[in-house]
C-alpha cells in the first residue's frame, strides 16, 4: 500500500493486496475494503457499472461476467482497485460488439479476457481472411485490442478476437468495424444556377449541392449582409461509403423586389469551409433593352452588302421579332438567336443581311421586338452612296447651258472648256447658278444638283464639259460648239463616262 504523511488522508486498502486476482468460475470472490471513511465499492466492465455500500464485496459463485475492475473509494475521494479475472474455459471473452473507428485515430475492439493466461491474444479476419497488411494492434487483456491508426480501407472489416488454446484458435463473436472518415478536404459546393431574374410574385427556388465524405458536414443558406434565418429543405444520399451528397433547397414562394441580392450557400467541416453564391434580381415588370452593334446611321456604296446587327436584353423571353422597311416586313434575310446557350441567358442577337444594295434601297430599317410585358424598337438610317448620274444637259433659250446631276452624297458639278479639237478640257468655267433641287424620290435617296453657265462667253469652236462627281465616282456630259459667221450652233451634246 502507498505510504503517506501522518495527518494526510490515505487511500483505502484492499484484501487480497494485489493488483490482479484470478479465480475459477463457480468459486467465491471475497474482497475486503479497509478504511475508516469507507464509502463504496464500484465494479466496472465494458459499459456496465455496479455499486455496493458494504465494505466487503462477496460474490458467492463467480461467473465470467464478474470479470472486471473493482474499486473501493473513501469519503476523501481516494480509491484503490483490484482487477478480477474469472477464468471460464467456456467464455474466454467478454464482448461489446459495437465498433466504430475514426479515420487516423485508434479504436478499441472491446473483447477483454476472462483469463489472462493465454497465448496469442490477437485479432483475426473473419472466415480465415487475412487482416489488412498495414493493420497494427495493441492487446490489453483487461480492455480489449486497440487497432492503431484506423484507415478508411478498414471500413466494414469483419474481425474476431482470438486466442490459441490447446493448439487451436478460439474466436470471439464477430465485430464489424465502421470507419468514420476524417475530413481531408473542404466540402465541394455547387449551385443550380449562378443568377436568377424574376418578376415580382414569381417563385424563387435555388438548390445547393454539398458533397463530402460524411453526413456530419455542416451547411446553410445565408443572405449576404443579413442574419435572417432562411427556410431550407434538405434531401441527402449516400453514394457508397465515403461519398455523401446533400441538396439544400432555398425557396421564396413569392419574390419581391427587396428580395433581390446575393445568397450564399456555405458549408464547413473540420478541415475548412467552402461557399458558392447565387444572385437574385427581382424586377417589378419585364424589360427589353436594345443595343446597336453598329452605328445607327449607315453609309454603304451602291452594290455592296451591309449587316444591321443588334443585341438586346429581353425578360421575359422575346415572343415576336421583326425587321421592317418602308412598312414592309422582311420574311427572310434576317436571323435571331440567343447570345449564349446558358439557361439564364437573357441576351439575344438579331441580324438583317442587306445584299447588293441599290441606290433606291436607302432609308429607315427598323427592328421591333416584344415580350409579354413590353415592346421596343430601334431604327437604322441607311444611306446608299451612288455615283452621279447626269439627268439633263441642255442649252436653254436664254443661251444658258444647264446640267442636272443626281447622286449621293450630293454631287459637285464643275464646268470646263476645251478650245478647238483638244481632248483635254482644263480651263475651268465658273457657273452662273447652282441649285440643290428637292428630289421627288424617298428620303435617303439621291440628291439632285442643277448648275448653269452662260454660253455667250465662248467665242471659239470647242467643247464644253459638265463634270458631276462625288466620293463614289464621276460622270461627264459634253456640248460641242461650231461658229458659222457670227452664229453659234450647238451640236448635239453627248455624255462620256469617266470612271
Amino acid at each position: 500500500q502507498p505510504s503517506v504523511s501522518p495527518g494526510e488522508p490515505s487511500p483505502p486498502s484492499i484484501h487480497p493486496g494485489k493488483s490482479d486476482l484470478i479465480v475459477r468460475v463457480g468459486d467465491e470472490i471475497r474482497l475486503l475494503c479497509t478504511d475508516p471513511g469507507f464509502v463504496k465499492w464500484t465494479f466496472e466492465i465494458l459499459d456496465e457499472t455496479n455499486e455496493n455500500k458494504q465494505n466487503e464485496w462477496i460474490t458467492e459463485k463467480a461467473e465470467a461476467t464478474n470479470t472486471g475492475k473493482y474499486t473501493c473509494t473513501n469519503k476523501h475521494g481516494l480509491s484503490n482497485s483490484i482487477y478480477v479475472f474469472v477464468r471460464d474455459p467456456a467464455k474466454l471473452f467478454l464482448v461489446d460488439r459495437s465498433l466504430y473507428g475514426k479515420e487516423d485515430n485508434d479504436t478499441l475492439v472491446r473483447c477483454p479476457l476472462t483469463d489472462p493466461e493465454v497465448t496469442n491474444y490477437s485479432l483475426k479476419g473473419c472466415q480465415g481472411k487475412p487482416l489488412p497488411k498495414d493493420l497494427r494492434f495493441i492487446p490489453d487483456p483487461k480492455a480489449g485490442i486497440m487497432i492503431k491508426s484506423v484507415k478508411r480501407a478498414y471500413h466494414r472489416l469483419c474481425l474476431h478476437c482470438s486466442v490459441d488454446q490447446e493448439g487451436k484458435s478460439v474466436l470471439s463473436e464477430k465485430f464489424i468495424l465502421k470507419v468514420r472518415p476524417a475530413f481531408k478536404a473542404v466540402p465541394v459546393v455547387s449551385v443550380s444556377k449562378a443568377s436568377y431574374l424574376l418578376r415580382e410574385g414569381e417563385e424563387f427556388t435555388v438548390t445547393c449541392t454539398i458533397k463530402d465524405v460524411s453526413s456530419s458536414v455542416y451547411s446553410t443558406w445565408k443572405r449576404e449582409n443579413s442574419q435572417t434565418k432562411l427556410q431550407e429543405k434538405y434531401n441527402s444520399w449516400h453514394h457508397g461509403d465515403f461519398n455523401y451528397e446533400r441538396q439544400a433547397t432555398l425557396t421564396i414562394s413569392s419574390a419581391r423586389v427587396n428580395d433581390s441580392g446575393v445568397f450564399m450557400c456555405y458549408a464547413n467541416n473540420t478541415f475548412g469551409s467552402a461557399n458558392v453564391t447565387t444572385t437574385l434580381e427581382v424586377v417589378d415588370k419585364g424589360f427589353i433593352n436594345i443595343f446597336p452593334m453598329i452605328n445607327t446611321t449607315v453609309f454603304v456604296n451602291d452594290g455592296e452588302n451591309v449587316d444591321l446587327i443588334v443585341e438586346y436584353e429581353a425578360f421575359p423571353k422575346p415572343e415576336h421579332q421583326q425587321w421592317i422597311y418602308m412598312n414592309r416586313t422582311f420574311t427572310d434575310k434576317w436571323e435571331d438567336y440567343p447570345k449564349s446557350e446558358n439557361e439564364s441567358n437573357i441576351r439575344y442577337v438579331s441580324e438583317l443581311h442587306l445584299t447588293r444594295l441599290k441606290g433606291t434601297e436607302g432609308g429607315t430599317y427598323t427592328f421591333l421586338v416584344s415580350n409579354s410585358d413590353v415592346n421596343a424598337a430601334i431604327a437604322f438610317n441607311v444611306y446608299v452612296n451612288t455615283k452621279p448620274e447626269i439627268l439633263t444637259y441642255d442649252r436653254l433659250v436664254n443661251g444658258m447651258l444647264q446640267c442636272v446631276a443626281a447622286g449621293f452624297p450630293e454631287p459637285t458639278i464643275d464646268w470646263y472648256f476645251c478650245p478647238g479639237t483638244e481632248q483635254r478640257c482644263s480651263a475651268s468655267v465658273l457657273p452662273v447658278d447652282v441649285q440643290t433641287l428637292n428630289s421627288s424620290g424617298p428620303p435617303f435617296g439621291k440628291l439632285v444638283v442643277q448648275s448653269s453657265i452662260d454660253s455667250s462667253a465662248f467665242k471659239h469652236n470647242g467643247t464644253v464639259e459638265c463634270k458631276a462627281y462625288n466620293d463614289v465616282g464621276k460622270t461627264s456630259a459634253y456640248f460641242n460648239f461650231a461658229f458659222k459667221g457670227n452664229n453659234k450652233e450647238q451640236i448635239h451634246p453627248h455624255t462620256l463616262f469617266t470612271p
Partner: nanobody, 128 residues
C-alpha cells in the same frame, strides 16, 4: 533508457534444449512487454516469442509454437526463453526486445517497428 543484455546462447545438438535469459536495467521492467526476435544466416529478422507486462499473456510465432516457452520474473527484471526440441533451422542470433506499447500484426506477430529497445543478441547454433 533501458539496457538489455542477453545470455544463454551456445552450440547444441538437434533435439536438445537451451534457456536464454535477458536482464533489463534502467527503467520499470514490469511496465514493458518483452520478447525475442531471431535472425538466421542470410535471413531477415523474425519474431519468435513475446510476453505482455502482466506476465501471463504470451505470443509465439508458428515456427516455435509448442517448443518454445517465454516467461518473466519481474522481481529479477529478467525474461526467459526456454527452447526445447531444437532444430538446425533454429540456428540464429537471438535478440531480446522491449516495448512499452507493443504493436502486433496479423497472426499475433510482434511488429518490430514498435520495439523501443533491443539487446545486442546471443548466438544459438543447432547442429544436426
Amino acid at each position: 533508457q533501458v539496457q538489455l543484455v542477453e545470455s544463454g546462447g551456445g552450440l547444441v545438438q538437434a533435439g536438445g534444449s537451451l534457456r536464454l535469459s535477458c536482464v533489463a536495467s534502467g527503467r520499470t521492467f514490469s511496465s514493458y512487454a518483452m520478447g525475442w526476435f531471431r535472425q538466421g544466416p542470410g535471413k531477415e529478422r523474425e519474431f519468435a516469442a513475446a510476453i505482455l507486462s502482466n506476465g501471463l499473456t504470451t505470443y509465439y510465432a508458428d515456427s516455435v509454437k509448442g517448443r518454445f516457452t517465454i516467461s518473466r520474473d519481474n522481481a529479477k527484471d529478467t525474461v526467459y526463453l526456454q527452447m526445447n526440441s531444437l532444430k538446425p533451422e533454429d540456428t540464429a542470433n537471438y535478440y531480446c526486445a522491449a516495448a512499452f506499447t507493443p504493436e502486433f500484426r496479423d497472426g499475433g506477430i510482434w511488429d518490430d517497428a514498435s520495439v523501443d529497445y533491443w539487446g545486442q543478441g546471443t548466438q544459438v547454433t543447432v547442429s544436426s
